[in-house]
Amino acid sequence: MNGRVDYLVTEEEINLTRGPSGLGFNIVGGTDQQYVSNDSGIYVSRIKENGAAALDGRLQEGDKILSVNGQDLKNLLHQDAVDLFRNAGYAVSLRVQHRLQVQNGPIGHRGEGDPSG
């Protein structure tokens, strides 16, 4: 029998400077592209090697991005979220939610809706 899987959720403000090739990550999610069941939030799906996000080191695949330069990402269409990042300017402030899996008891399995899969 599997033990209970809990998640430690923390928030962090990450300030990135757009590099020569941009911010350097991919996103999934949005009201028209729900990635996690019952959650239309925006998640980081890929950090590009040697990009601004990778060099900074704090943003991780699976992180949920709550806001960009203070603008909430709730209830946005996927393409609108992409456009928001693309038009965010040179200095970009991200409010992100990290979700760290904490194992209690025997080894469990990651849930179907976990964005880090």
């Epitope: 090739s21 941009g22 990550f25 991919n26 999934v28 592209q33 799906s45 996927h78 393409q79 693309r86």
Partner: nanobody
């Protein structure tokens, strides 16, 4: 990981048509950004077509002849190739990136993609 399997290649006469398919594993297919590339003998791998969440794009050499599409319910991407020419002869590869880049997308750059299929041979005589 994502597995990609291409099919539909073959030998066709100039002016003919083929439809390539690329089946991708994974429950989040609809979040994939996808592309077709090709590589002729002795040449570099070159971009053919791309399909994102809300856009498509084509190499100039195939515009008006090739059409890229996807069926999210079947986890499949297609490349309909019409009016084929001998210079279209190559191994055709499908490629996938997870999600949409937040930067201006250089979708013709193979480095933008995370996963690649094994390829399917197209020969136009």
């Amino acid at each position: 990981d994502v597995q990609l399997v291409e099919s539909g290649g073959g030998l066709v006469q100039a002016g003919g048509s083929l439809r390539l398919s690329c089946v991708a594993s994974g429950r989040t297919f609809r979040t994939y950004t996808m592309g077709w590339f090709r590589q002729a003998p002795g040449k570099e791998r070159e971009f053919v077509a791309h399909i994102g969440w809300s856009s498509t794009d084509y190499a100039d050499s195939v515009k008006g002849r090739f059409t890229i599409s996807r069926d999210n319910a079947k986890n499949t991407m297609y490349l309909q190739m019409n009016s084929l020419k001998p210079e279209d002869t190559a191994v055709y590869y499908c490629a996938v990136a997870i999600g949409s880049p937040v930067d201006s997308y250089r979708h013709s750059d193979p480095l933008e993609y995370d996963y690649w299929g094994q390829g399917t041979q197209v020969t136009v005589s």
